[in-house]
């Protein structure tokens, strides 16, 4: 290789070792018989050299720095050339550096031809390996404006007092032009101005100077956004920190065309403006920081440019063509009415008919879109009926109660998914078997999952709510006499992540007379809390419920009731509880309207708890809460 640098070119070429690799064999630059690992070539020098290995690009990098002095003479403005031409350089990873020094009063503008630049944050890299690192100067201090890739929106960067631009090209990249030019401008009276041009819809992520380190004290940085008039821009702050200000206040200022209150001043913690039409400017203003504890000001934000919301073109497909007896409603979630103006929030069918709520029915494929500034203002409620009309056909048949993935993929939170399970009267009953054992929600042990199953009777005349159940408990199955509704209710957006934990199978089984039977297989680790259905309203008249409680061979179960008396007063009939050992059939019967509830009792084998209600007088209802705790057996009593 031969590199010859013209005199007065102010170019220095440096070939040096790159980041060390785990290559076994070292490689050297060979020049007049010497093997060296660093070669520096200055203006006016001509040097011939070779490499001692076949793939020097795995070992060495080359830096070409051109110093441009605009202090002592005229500045060479215009398109910047790659000198020396890349074809004359060894095929190493190359960094071209232009260091422009200018007076404080002179503005310098870097203009980037297409493709424009896209800023990247710490730890990110450019797909093609081509990076632009741009820094400015405040007196003697270097300020990093940012690192940029190709294919973005940044078209111009204006600075004053000097600029350092480093263009990094991988050894295999064919690029032979700098892709930018330098122009002089009048003083910009701030650290820098970054111009970002949107041709159509898109987004740009931008950062304050020195990000993720602190923005220079009491400085001003401006971003100018060029947005077509038919599009709308929204700003959101992805990450920011505030420093400790002694004087002035850190803030962002917007200059929004058509606004009567320009500049509009926002705190960094405020919700930033959205739906802006056309061009706008955003400026970040620092403050005088506390010398003892300055903290740091930094900002990373995103500008999203899209068609106005009434032209929103994001289509969601909801395929209900294979479903039967199902309806899906998207509607506003209840909120306290405020007097403040709230933009409309609509859901549209086929992008044409828009309304504040929409019901989709089974049997077809639906295309929907949203016109809404905040989709958390909406939620979804779904109802599906699974019915059996012919008991001979249905018996032992099973159905999976799961939210279809099409529904989970919608950008609106699911509130309720209800399955109405209908059986022929006095012919069949139902059994619910969860994928994961269930816990009954009680005050003593509330559910803290992102969803629960609400199980209630679906017979219009019957007011029977079996309870709220969530995954992670000891209830292995729930058998119910007749029609019920099972509602999966979500409580947190994290349901999307926990959706895999949902899973309930319903089977049609031979008819039985009790209103409900809970099969409980307690874990040794925790106390199981169980309560009678219709808690707070009381077990309905003449209703009977049972719990089948399994006790492992090596354990003993402690059954504890949480009050002394049941509190029920019977108008007609008797209320009673039977505790029956399953192995010996031995049973204890307690009159709930007369007797004291049993003290904690120990059971070495599986047992039943059956509670049957009378017709109570109003206000004296039957509500019972009890717990089962397993402990290891100390003495074998068998």
């Amino acid at each position: 290789f031969e590199i010859a640098l013209p005199r007065e070119s102010n170019i220095t070429v440096l070939i040096k070792l790159g980041t060390p690799t785990l290559l076994a064999k070292p490689c050297y630059i060979v020049i007049s018989k010497r093997h060296i690992t660093m070669l520096s070539i200055k203006s006016g020098e001509r040097i011939v050299f070779t490499f001692s290995c076949q793939s020097p690009e795995n070992h060495f990098v080359i830096e070409i720095q051109k110093n441009i002095d605009c202090m002592s003479g005229p500045c060479p403005f215009g398109e910047v050339q790659l000198q020396p031409s890349t074809s004359l350089l060894p095929t190493l990873n190359r960094t071209f550096i232009w260091d422009v020094k200018a007076h404080k009063s002179i503005g310098l503008e870097l203009q980037f031809s297409i493709p424009r630049l896209r800023q990247i944050g710490p730890g990110e890299s450019c797909p093609d390996g081509v990076t632009h690192s741009i820094s400015g100067r405040i007196d003697a201090t270097v300020v990093r404006i940012g690192t940029f890739c190709s294919n973005g929106t940044v078209s111009r960067i204006k600075m004053q007092e000097g600029v350092k631009m480093a263009l990094h090209l991988p050894w295999f990249h064919p690029r032979n032009v700098s892709g930018f030019s330098i122009a002089n401008r009048s003083s910009i009276k701030r650290l820098c101005i970054i111009e970002s041009v949107f041709e159509g819809e898109g987004s740009a992520t931008l950062m304050s100077a020195n990000y993720p380190e602190g923005f220079p004290e009491d400085e001003l940085m401006t971003w100018q956004f060029v947005v077509p008039a038919h599009l709308r821009a929204s700003v959101s702050f992805l990450n920011f920190n505030l420093s400790n200000c002694e004087r002035k206040e850190e803030r962002v200022e917007y200059y929004i065309p058509g606004s009567t209150t320009n500049p509009e001043v926002f705190k960094l913690e405020d919700k930033q403006p959205g739906n802006m039409a056309g061009n706008f400017n955003l400026s970040l203003q620092g403050c005088d920081q506390d010398a003892q504890s300055p903290g740091i000001l930094r900002l990373q934000f995103q500008v999203l440019v899209q068609h106005p919301q009434n032209e929103s073109n994001k289509i969601y497909v909801v395929d209900l063509s294979n479903e039967r007896a199902m309806s899906l409603t998207i509607e506003p979630r209840p909120v306290k009415q405020s007097r403040k103006f709230v933009p409309g929030c609509f859901v549209c069918l086929e992008s044409r008919t828009c309304s504040s709520n929409l019901t989709l029915t089974s049997g077809s494929k639906h295309k929907i879109s949203f016109l809404c500034d905040d989709l958390t203002r909406l939620w979804m409620n779904v109802e599906k009926t699974i019915s059996c009309t012919d008991h001979r056909y249905c018996q032992r048949k099973s159905y999976s109660l799961q939210v279809p993935s099409d529904i989970l993929h919608l950008p609106v939170e699911l509130h309720d998914f209800s399955w109405k399970l209908l059986v022929p009267k006095d012919r069949l009953s139902l059994v619910l078997v969860p994928a994961q054992k269930l816990q009954q929600h009680t005050h003593e042990k509330p559910c803290n999952t992102s969803f629960s199953y609400l199980v209630a009777s679906a017979i219009p005349s019957q007011d029977l709510y079996f309870g709220s159940f969530c995954p992670g408990g000891s209830i292995k199955q729930i058998q119910v006499k007749q029609n019920i509704s099972v509602t999966l209710r979500t409580f947190a957006p994290s349901f999307q992540q926990e959706a895999s934990r949902q899973g309930l199978t319903v089977s049609f089984i031979p008819y039985f007379k009790e209103e409900g039977v809970f099969t409980v297989t307690p874990d040794t680790k925790s106390k199981v809390y169980l309560r009678t259905p219709n808690w707070d309203r009381g077990l309905p008249s003449l209703t009977s419920v049972s719990w089948n409680i399994s006790v492992p061979r090596d354990q003993v179960a402690c059954l504890t009731f949480f009050k002394e008396r049941s509190g029920v007063v019977c108008q007609t009939g008797r209320a009673f509880m039977i505790i029956q050992e399953q192995r010996t059939r031995a049973e204890e019967i307690f009159s709930l309207d007369e007797d004291v509830l049993p003290k904690p009792s120990f059971h070495h084998h599986s047992f039943w708890v059956n509670i049957s209600n009378c017709s109570p007088t109003s206000g004296k209802q039957l509500d019972l809460l009890f717990s089962v705790t397993l402990t290891p057996r100390t003495v074998d009593l068998t």
């Epitope: 050297y28 020049i31 010497r34 093997h35 060296i36 660093m38 070669l39 001692s52």
Partner: antibody
């Protein structure tokens, strides 16, 4: 492990020819960049570089002695040789051979062989 | 030819103090961003031993008490702190240009 060992006659009379051999191990003179130099140190004086031979058989000599010096190598037997013609008493010194792995500094030296020129 | 002048010719330094040896070249020994100046230590009856290569690089196995600095024509070898075992003669050597030359040597005594 790199080792160099010089050998020579020990005593010569003026006008005779000095033949020195440097036998080495732990490296090869066919490796790119590798070279061996001869350096001497007269008693009570400083070090003086005499000659160098590179891996590609290129040779360099100290101009003040060039007409009397010949350096050569036998790559296969890992040896470098130096001949100095017409020795006189000023050539009395300890002669060292030293390895130069990258064409400049000497990282390994032999223990040296002493030459006395006396009539 | 490039003449290397070492100073002082000899110096005596107390244990655990700093010793500084200078080497001045009659012309620059720098080429292509490298300084082709090296330092050796020689004890009586032993061959020289490489301490520092290319002005400032410490040869492996040499204690970090030894350091080198300088460029173009002025170079310095520093030993800090000096230990009893450092009593020896120190030579600078250049090979930026033929003929390769050594300095006259600096004899270090430990007080």
């Amino acid at each position: 492990e790199v080792q160099l060992q010089e050998s020579g006659p020990g005593i010569l009379q003026p006008s005779q020819t000095l033949s020195l051999t440097c036998s080495f191990s732990g490296f090869s003179l066919s490796t790119s960049g590798m070279g061996v130099s001869w350096i001497r140190k007269p008693s009570g004086k400083g070090l003086e570089w005499l000659a160098h031979i590179f891996w590609d058989d290129d040779k360099r000599y100290n101009p003040s002695l060039k007409s009397r010096l010949t350096i050569s190598k036998d790559t296969s037997s890992n040896q470098v040789f130096l001949m100095i013609t017409s020795v006189d008493t000023a050539d009395t010194a300890t002669y060292y051979c030293a390895r130069s792995p990258y064409g400049d500094y000497f990282d390994y030296w032999g223990q040296g062989t002493t030459l006395t020129v006396s009539s | 030819k490039i003449v290397l002048t070492q100073s002082p010719a000899s110096l005596a330094v107390s244990l655990r103090q700093r010793a500084t040896i200078s080497c001045r070249a009659s012309e620059s020994v720098d080429s292509y961003g490298n300084s082709f100046m090296h330092w050796y230590q020689q004890k009586p009856g032993q061959p020289p031993k490489l301490l520092i290569y290319r002005a400032s690089n410490l040869e492996s196995g040499v204690p970090a008490r030894f350091s080198g600095s300088g460029s173009r024509t002025d170079f310095t070898l520093t030993i800090d702190p000096v230990e009893a075992d450092d009593a020896a003669t120190y030579y600078c050597q250049q090979n930026n240009e033929d003929p390769w030359t050594f300095g006259g040597g600096t004899k270090l005594e430990i007080k």
